[in-house]
């Protein structure tokens, strides 16, 4: 015999108290699949979390972080504070990048400058706490009479993939 609950669509639950008829999920709850015997409580985006997508009867709310924070974990389970470019977040808070390292993001740790000489190139623009070194042509190409090199446009800030 087929389970009568299997006919209950998403957004409803199979109500044992009412002869296993399909009842709509109560307010602030949802069921994302059919055949559920209960509805799940909607996630509430409070504090540093803000609502990215409202809860519906068939899908949970989705949260992201208020400005000055960024998401960590599947479904943005945690908000972590941003730092400024040129800094990294340590367990003791935001700290400036050490000499020879940089961070062009508001999150993550400071990255060592590119060592241009490893690819046989020269330094065209020095690095800073916020920006990597820009490598130019190889030193041999910079002999007297060689044409001048136009520095490239500033690097586009790399994107953040959703976690």
């Amino acid at each position: 015999l087929q389970d009568p609950c299997s006919n209950c669509p998403a957004g409803t639950f199979c109500d044992n108290n009412r002869n296993q008829i399909c009842s709509p999920c109560p307010p602030n709850s949802f069921s994302s699949a059919g055949g559920q015997r209960t509805c799940d409580i909607c996630r509430q985006c409070k504090g540093v979390f803000r609502t990215r997508k409202e809860c519906s009867s068939t899908s949970n709310a989705e949260c992201d972080c208020t400005p000055g924070f960024h998401c960590l974990g599947a479904g943005c389970s945690m908000c972590e504070q941003d730092c400024k470019q040129g800094q990294e977040l340590t367990k003791k808070g935001c700290k400036d990048c050490c000499f020879g390292t940089f961070n062009d993001q508001k999150r993550g740790i400071c990255r060592p400058w590119t060592n241009c000489s490893l690819d046989g190139k020269s330094v065209l623009v020095n690095g800073t706490k916020e920006r990597d070194v820009v490598c130019g042509p190889s030193p041999a190409d910079l002999s007297p009479g060689a044409s001048s090199v136009t520095p490239p446009a500033p690097a586009r800030e790399p994107g953040h993939s959703p976690q």
């Epitope: 960590l72 990294e88 340590t90 367990k91 990048c97 050490c98 020879g100 390292t101 961070n103 993001q105 999150r107 993550g108 740790i109 400071c110 990255r111 060592p112 400058w113 590119t114 060592n115 490893l118 690819d119 990597d132 070194v133 820009v134 490598c135 490239p152 690097a155 586009r156 800030e157 790399p158 994107g159 953040h160 993939s161 976690q163």
Partner: antibody
Framework: QVQLVQSGAEVKKPGASVKVSCKAS????????MHWVRQAPGQGLEWMGW????????NYAQKFQGRVTMTRDTSISTAYMELSRLRSDDTAVYYC?????????????WGQGTLVTVSS | YVLTQPPSVSVAPGETARITCGGD??????VHWYQKKPDQAPVLVVY???YRPSGIPERISGSNSGNTATLTLSRVEAGDEADYYC????????????FGGGTQLIIL
């Protein structure tokens, strides 16, 4: 969806060079650093270096400096890793892997791997 | 910087496996964990000490303090049998990327 597709297996003689490619799709290639990691038979994972596909800037593990060159072709969203003066202990599976947009997090997408066999 | 892992950890199905990763003041670093099965690419299972990427089950968790980071797999299944690697990034230019030696998880 994000995909990293690597070139096929290679067999090389000691002293030769090998160039492995990694074609990216499903995201902005220039926005994310690419790393190379290898695993020799019966050994663990070993980080080799990274390239910033936007600027071409690189950083190599000290062990590989002077033998490895990482390049990219932004027009075809492809990163390359060339290893020269190959030795038998360079026999390994070589992986490209994407950094998720900032330094200090885990490598979130990986290529399928390229087996490089160095044998006389 | 050196990361030390036990070569293997054995556990019965349904039990909890704990894989450790030791390093000097590793608690000050962000530790990532990868699962590696034969003939497959590594998969990121925990990043920045304790965060799971989408699609990784909640029974996998991580922690990090002092000189030891730990990957915990609860209610272990046969499909969890794999090698697990911890990894950190340094700001040092000599060797920014460091992996532990790996731990083989054996399901009894």
């Amino acid at each position: 969806q994000v995909q990293l597709v690597q070139s096929g297996a290679e067999v090389k003689k000691p002293g030769a060079s090998v160039k492995v490619s990694c074609k990216a799709s499903g995201y902005s290639f220039t926005g994310y650093y690419m790393h190379w990691v290898r695993q020799a038979p019966g050994q663990g994972l070993e980080w080799m270096g990274w390239i910033n596909p936007n600027s071409g800037g690189t950083n190599y593990a000290q062990k590989f400096q002077g033998r490895v060159t990482m390049t990219r072709d932004t027009s075809i969203s492809t990163a390359y890793m060339e290893l020269s003066r190959l030795r038998s202990d360079d026999t390994a599976v070589y992986y490209c892997a994407r950094e998720p947009g900032y330094y200090g997090s885990g490598l979130d997408y990986w290529g399928q791997g390229t087996l490089v066999t160095v044998s006389s | 910087y050196v990361l030390t892992q036990p070569p293997s950890v054995s556990v019965a199905p349904g039990e909890t496996a704990r894989i450790t990763c030791g390093g000097d003041d590793i608690g000050d670093k962000r530790v990532h964990w990868y699962q590696k099965k034969p003939d497959q690419a590594p998969v990121l299972v925990v990043y920045e000490d304790r965060y799971r990427p989408s699609g990784i089950p909640e029974r996998i968790s991580g922690s990090n303090s002092g000189n030891t980071a730990t990957l915990t797999l609860s209610r272990v299944e046969a499909g969890d049998e794999a090698d697990y690697y911890c990894q950190v990034w340094n700001s040092s230019s000599d060797h920014p990327g460091v992996f532990g030696g790996g731990t083989q998880l054996i399901i009894l």
